[in-house]
């Protein structure tokens, strides 16, 4: 009887050792959905156990109260509950506690206090119409109808937002409404003219820290104005035979001109400078016209108009031909974002603060879609992404403006997004040797690259054998494989390697010879020493004993006529001749292995080749070395940053002292780093190749028809004056 | 339905004593604060003391503070006034009314007693 | 203190009538304001509390409204049983005041 009762207490005690009581709701919010319902949320919102919940409510300011339960039929584990009309009365305050009940106990919440003004959401207003009024420009007057459901009595506060039709950045407008009119209005000033702009309405009493959802969205029109203004630019051309400089303008709606606006027609007029009186005008509807011009400075206007008048006029400066140029651009950057490519530029000039930004593809063909933006009072360029196209590569110049003098470009190229090369290599083997092999390449076309091709990677192996790789710069297009096997057949492919990727060129095959040149000079040089030496011993034993040697060479032949012959029986000339025979044999089949010129079935075709090719790799050979030094010199001189690479520069306007560095590998997301690299070390930017093609006119600022970048390779001698080269 | 039933209160003679007491039903008793409000004969309304739902907090009008003791007895619903020292001018109808049910609530009186009179002369 | 002021002192309305009673505090009650009436040899009756909340079992035809330090009792329609003393009080502070009382009766 009484171990029973003992272990009854130790279970009793076991019990409640093990008894887990519910978590402490916490974390007490609750929200006032005006005359529909008033609900509470917390946390714990699951229990390891099963937990039901009560809620205690006090209302009606306290002289009321009443319990909502969250019990196994309803909510269950739910850590939510609402109370109904008709006891939701607005204003109160209620007071909130949280009772979390399991089968081991009770935990009460703190208490929390409510005052419903302060947590009332009530529905959304709703827009009826967004219109211009007439003779008021740039104002749109807003009209909704205030929520059925919202306290009459009380001060709604609203928040409009707005933005132009083609933008997704909001803005937003905060004002309070005391009338309690259904029908509300609000007049949106300081729009930009003759604008569609999408509106939506939110609302909450005064107090409230709870909005009403947003309203549904609706478009209005601002009314139509004179056109706002023109962006002028122009692409200078080479001059012609005759003297006349063609000129390409270019026009567009200036930046902040309504989405909307059409102009019907452009006026142009221009004159050179100090001579008005030489004025020539055109009218056109396009937004592009070339002008031709003489050799002195222009000056261009142009003016966009509509049936309410013209809009400011757009001015430009053509230089004088003969007209020097200033240069303030040091270096400069491309980097990608996430979804933008962000150009950056460092100046020596800080009074410009005015920068035109061309961009255009660099394709091999005529530059199709040329585009141009104008840049204030910043360093930097930025464009989305996806105005770009993938795996193109763009040409991107930057021309610093100086109240009317537009100064020397400064470019960069760039794509938004590298892909593998599009096709390989188109690869051949020159100069085969015996171990070694000169493999030569062609650039991959420009319009097959996808990305600036970082390396390219040599693939060989032997018939059976394993496979062998090298990887060479970009700039390299040659290289000379050696400690290859005698007389081996070898495959042999091209990798081209951009950041995405690499790409194989062709496969080819070849043989290594079984026999160097220099072997058969050694062979032709021994048998032609050991005939010298012959000769030379004979001239001497001829010296010596002329009668011998006479005797030799010229033998005597007996007479016929006092031959005995006849007499001589046939066995012994049989004899005789056999004798002859065994004192002077000869194997033919060692004779094949042992002849010096014998040789495989190619080497003779290849022979011919060889010998030439031989004077080739040993000139090939030195200018390889001479490279070698001068990449190992320009390596010290400029130490380029990380995400700077080396490819064609493309700005046609070259300064005399400084080569640029002018494309940019383009690391995601790495801005900042590459700004301090940059910018850090200006002076060291080193160019890798400089490109140009045709003659370059000291006039052509970045002209469109000097825009093709064909690369120099391989100089054997610098070009002088015009620009300064660092051979690569 | 909720009921305040007061005591019967009586004659005192100034500087005497007189315990009042009410009797709850028809709610939770201990839940609400409760109240003593008094109505002298042909005058108004005047509050005299609040005692909190647990007796922990209790309020006075500055007149009765130190003669008067307000007091509950959760357990048998009961709310109690205690007058000492009384003076003619603490002669009223003392009504016993129920209070909020929270220490913030505004201190009205939704439900009152039937009133118990309380005379103070000599 | 709290001084509420109430006004009229007395008032007589015919049947039908509509009534306002004024209940003027001496500093900002912030709606901590309840409606009380009496009738001879009777317990007040809660009426109105919160400045215009009804309590439960009043006639329609009682509203209360204001806010800050002025406040108002409105009976639309006068009927017999509205005869009676209105008090208006103040929740908010201790001590707890009430207005000297309003005498409606019927004309």
């Known amino acids: 009887m009484m171990w029973a009762k003992v272990l009854w207490m130790l279970l009793l005690l076991c019990k409640l050792s093990l008894a887990v009581l519910p978590a402490k709701p916490e974390n007490i919010s609750c929200i006032f959905y005006y005359e529909e319902n008033f609900t509470c949320t917390w946390s714990p919102e699951k229990e390891a156990s099963y937990t039901w919940y009560k809620v205690k409510r006090t209302y009606s300011y306290g002289y009321k109260s009443d319990i909502c339960s969250t019990d196994n039929s309803t909510r269950g584990n739910h850590a939510s509950c609402s109370f109904l009309p008709p006891t939701i009365t607005n204003p109160d305050n209620y007071t909130i506690q949280v009772e979390a009940q399991n089968a081991d106990g009770i935990m009460k919440s703190d208490i929390t206090y409510w005052n419903l003004d302060a947590i009332m959401k009530i529905e959304p207003p709703e827009i009826f119409s967004v219109k211009s009024v007439l003779g008021i420009k740039r104002m749109l007057q807003i009209k909704w109808i205030r929520p059925v459901l919202a306290p009459h009595s009380s001060t709604l506060k609203y928040t409009l937002r707005f933005r132009t039709i083609n933008s997704a950045y909001w803005m937003e407008v905060n004002f309070t409404k005391e009338d309690i009119d259904r029908d509300e209005t609000y007049n949106l000033t300081e729009l930009q003219a003759f604008t569609e702009y999408v509106m939506t309405l939110r609302c909450a009493p005064a107090e409230s820290m709870f909005w009403s959802g947003w309203s549904q969205e609706k478009v209005g029109t601002t009314e139509e104005e004179a056109p706002y203004g023109l962006d002028l630019w122009r692409v200078l051309k080479p001059a012609m035979v005759d003297g006349r400089r063609p000129v390409q303008l270019m026009w567009k709606k200036a930046t902040g001109a309504p989405v909307l606006e059409k102009a019907l027609g452009y006026n142009i007029w221009y004159f050179p400078e100090n001579n008005t009186n030489l004025t020539e005008t055109v009218n056109t509807t396009n937004q592009t016209h070339e002008l031709y011009l003489g050799g002195k400075t222009y000056w261009v206007y142009v003016v966009s108009y509509n049936s309410l008048g013209e809009s400011p006029v757009a001015t430009l400066r053509i230089p004088a031909l003969n007209e020097k140029t200033f240069q303030c651009i040091e270096a400069m950057q491309a980097c990608l974002t996430q979804d933008q490519l962000v150009v950056e530029w460092q100046s020596s000039a800080p009074e410009v603060d005015t920068w035109m930004v061309e961009w255009f593809p660099d394709v091999d063909s005529e530059p199709s879609s040329f585009s141009w933006e104008s840049v204030s009072q910043a360093r930097n360029w930025t464009i989305q992404k996806d105005e770009l196209k993938p795996l193109w590569c763009y040409n991107i110049s930057v021309y610093p403006v100086l109240r009317d003098r537009v100064g020397q470009p400064y470019s960069t190229q760039a794509y938004v997004q590298e892909g593998i090369p599009s096709a390989g290599p188109v690869t051949q083997a020159d100069s085969i040797g015996v171990k070694t092999v000169t493999i030569t390449w062609k650039e991959i076309p420009k319009s097959k690259r996808n990305g600036f091709i970082k390396n390219y990677t040599i693939f060989y192996q032997a018939e059976d054998g394993k496979e062998f790789s090298k990887t060479v710069n970009s700039n390299i297009l040659q290289y000379r494989l050696e400690s290859l096997t005698r007389r081996t057949s070898y495959s042999l492919q091209v990798m081209a390697s951009t950041n995405a990727g690499g790409t194989n060129g062709t496969k080819i095959n070849f043989k290594t010879l079984s026999i160097s040149v220099l072997e058969i000079f050694f062979i032709t040089s021994l048998v032609g020493g050991g005939f010298l030496i012959l000769i030379m011993l004979t001239v001497a034993y001829g010296l010596k004993k002329p009668n011998k040697l006479k005797h030799l060479c010229w033998p005597d032949v007996p007479n016929p006529a006092e031959s005995s012959i006849a007499t001589w029986r046939g066995d012994d000339f049989k004899d005789k001749l056999n004798l002859k025979e065994s004192d002077d044999p000869v194997n033919m089949e060692e004779d094949q292995v042992l002849k010096p010129y014998s040789a495989p079935t190619d080497f003779i075709d290849k022979l011919v080749v060889n010998f030439e090719n031989f004077l080739e790799e040993v000139s090939t050979e030195e200018l390889g070395k001479s490279q070698e030094n001068i990449l190992k010199e320009e390596k010290n001189k400029h130490v380029t940053s990380p995400y700077c690479l080396h490819h064609p520069p493309i700005s046609t306007e070259i300064p005399q002292r400084k080569p640029q560095q002018l494309c940019s590998r383009i690391p995601e997301g790495t801005c900042s780093e590459t700004k301090e690299q940059l910018f850090s070390s200006v002076q060291s930017l080193g160019p890798d190749h400089l490109c140009e093609e045709g003659e370059p006119n000291p006039y052509l600022k970045n002209s469109v028809t000097t825009r093709e970048f064909v690369c120099l390779k391989n100089f054997k001698t610098k070009p002088k004056e015009k620009f300064s080269v660092a051979v690569a | 339905e909720v009921q305040l039933v007061e005591s019967d209160g009586g004659l005192a003679q100034p500087g005497r004593s007189l315990k009042l007491s009410c009797a709850a039903s028809?709610?939770?008793?201990?839940?609400?604060?409760m109240a003593w409000v008094r109505q002298a004969p042909t005058k108004g309304l005047e509050w005299v003391a609040t005692i909190s739902y647990d007796g922990s907090s209790t309020y006075y009008r500055d007149s009765v503070r130190g003669r008067f003791t307000i007091s509950r007895d959760n357990a048998k619903s009961t709310l109690y006034l205690q007058m000492d020292s009384l003076r003619s001018e603490d002669t009223a109808t003392y009504y016993c009314?129920?209070?909020?049910?929270?220490?913030?609530?505004?201190?009205?009186?939704?439900?009152w007693g039937q009133g118990t009179l309380v005379t103070v002369s000599s | 203190d709290i001084q509420m002021t109430q006004s009229p002192a007395s008032l007589s309305a015919s049947l039908g009538e509509t009534v306002t009673i004024q209940c003027q505090t001496s500093?900002?009650?912030?709606?901590?304001l309840a409606w009380y009436q009496q009738k001879p040899g009777k317990s007040p009756q809660f009426l109105i509390y919160g400045a215009s909340r009804l309590e439960d079992g009043v006639p329609s035809r009682f509203s209360g409204s204001g806010s800050g330090t002025q406040y108002s009792l409105k009976i639309s329609s006068m009927q017999t049983e509205d005869e009676g003393v209105y008090f208006c009080?103040?929740?908010?502070?201790?001590?707890?005041?009430f207005g000297a009382g309003t005498k409606l009766e019927l004309k």
């Open positions: 028809g709610f939770t008793f201990s839940d609400y604060y």
């Open positions: 009080q103040q929740g908010l502070k201790y001590p707890n005041t």
């Open positions: 500093e900002d009650i912030y709606s901590g």
């Open positions: 009314a129920r209070g909020p049910l929270t220490d913030w609530a505004p201190n009205w009186f939704a439900y």
